[in-house]
């Protein structure tokens, strides 16, 4: 699975929430960022994440598609120079400071099994998705395509016009 271009084909800011409308928030604690899944108070401002979309070529020997097997990869950055990373050993989702080119752990294959929600599959561990576990983000193994509709791996994107990054 190779990224076909070093530049994203599109990017924009969005707030990320779970299928059950809990917000994904990011807090700086002891010089590192923590990721929380929580109910926000009525007028509390949602954290924004910069989503960068990249085109990726699916390996043709797996897909039988030749050059037609494109997929979308995303990186998620809630603050400058920090990106969500998949820690496949710990089954965790972490925020790490990185420089470009980003490591493979920062890329997630985009799925939408509903028209209004998305899922993020680890590039480095196919079949493993960002999900919600005990009010935190974690990596969750999905064993069949039917389970792609499982609510704990579904997220909603609330988009905004602005393209700058906080």
């Amino acid at each position: 699975m190779s990224i076909t271009g070093i530049s994203p084909i599109t990017e924009y800011l969005a707030s990320l929430s779970t299928y059950n409308d809990q917000s994904i928030t990011f807090a700086l604690e002891d010089e590192s960022y923590e990721i929380y899944v929580e109910d926000l108070k009525k007028d509390e401002k949602k954290d924004k994440v910069l989503l960068s979309y990249y085109e990726s070529q699916h390996p043709s020997n797996e897909s039988g598609d030749g050059v037609d097997g494109k997929m979308l990869m995303v990186t998620l950055s809630p603050t400058k120079d920090f990106w969500l990373h998949a820690n496949n050993k710990e089954h965790s989702v972490e925020l790490h400071k990185s420089e470009k080119p980003l490591p493979d752990q920062a890329f997630f294959v985009l799925h939408n099994m509903h028209s209004n929600s998305v899922s993020f599959e680890s590039k480095t561990d196919p079949g493993v998705f960002i999900g919600v576990k005990d009010n935190h983000l974690a990596l969750i193994k999905v064993d069949s395509s039917e389970n792609l509709s499982t609510e704990n791996i579904l997220f909603k994107l609330s988009e905004t016009h602005h393209h700058h990054h906080h």
Epitope: I9, D65, K70, M71, L72, N112, N116, S145, L148
Partner: antibody
Framework: EVQLVESGGGLVQPGGSLRLSCAAS????????MYWVRQAPGKGLEWVAS????????YYPDSVKGRFTISRDNAKNSLYLQMNSLRAEDTAVYYC??????????????WGQGTLVTVSS | DIQMTQSPSSLSASVGDRVTITCKAS??????LDWYQQKPGKAPKLLIY???NLQTGVPSRFSGSGSGTDFTLTISSLQPEDFATYYC????????FGGGTKVEIK
């Protein structure tokens, strides 16, 4: 090479039913969203139905909701559109289309050549 | 439901002209917008996706721009093979086509 071939169109009376088929080849069918889009004679394009790769969800505009049903058989690389209670305004060329990317409902990357459905008494 | 208003519905132009077609969404669709080209008796063809990305094989005289609610398709120098009907299409929330713009020979 990606190929989408529609069939099943024809003349049907108002109130009647018709089932369209789309045979897909040249790609991993089970990984893509699939769509039906129609075009009435001399008119523009209208989205008619969408279905997720695993057939878990389907979507329709109000104009066909409750009358049309999209389905797929991933083992047979086939897409279907069951059309019931047909009306004169359903007369159109019906196109089968494939999503541009694996797993996502963004863009209609490939289209079949269409099949004509005529609803008339 | 999101409405897509395309303008003009038709235009006459000459080979070499710069042509601009606009599409307005009834609400924010971010950059989830495509442009399709259709010639008489043929299936539509994807030209531009995610607002400004050219589909493989599409000539560079075609370009797209915009974000939010206002979008533009530009043909920098119209060629004989570009006389066709063009449709915008949003997939941010459901799926909706614009009404189409027929580009005819002046």
């Amino acid at each position: 090479e990606v190929q989408l071939v529609e069939s099943g169109g024809g003349l049907v009376q108002p109130g009647g039913s018709l089932r369209l088929s789309c045979a897909a080849s040249g790609f991993t069918f089970s990984s893509y969203w699939m769509y039906w889009v129609r075009q009435a004679p001399g008119k523009g394009l209208e989205w008619v139905a969408s279905i997720t790769p695993n057939a878990g969800e389907d979507y329709y505009p109000d104009s066909v909701k409750g009358r049309f049903t999209i389905s797929r058989d991933n083992a047979k690389n086939s897409l279907y559109l069951q059309m019931n209670s047909l009306r004169a305004e359903d007369t159109a060329v019906y196109y089968c289309a494939r999503g541009h990317y694996y797993y996502t409902s963004y863009s209609l990357g490939y289209w079949g050549q269409g099949t004509l459905v005529t609803v008339s008494s | 439901d999101i409405q897509m208003t395309q303008s003009p519905s038709s235009l006459s132009a000459s080979v070499g002209d710069r042509v601009t077609i606009t599409c307005k969404a009834s609400q924010n669709i971010n950059k989830h917008l495509d442009w399709y080209q259709q010639k008489p008796g043929k299936a539509p063809k994807l030209l531009i996706y995610f607002t400004n990305n050219l589909q493989t094989g599409v000539p560079s005289r075609f370009s797209g721009s915009g974000s939010g609610t206002d979008f533009t398709l530009t043909i920098s120098s119209l060629q004989p093979e570009d006389f066709a009907t063009y449709y915008c299409f949003q997939y941010n929330n459901g799926w909706t086509f614009g009404g189409g713009t027929k580009v005819e020979i002046k």
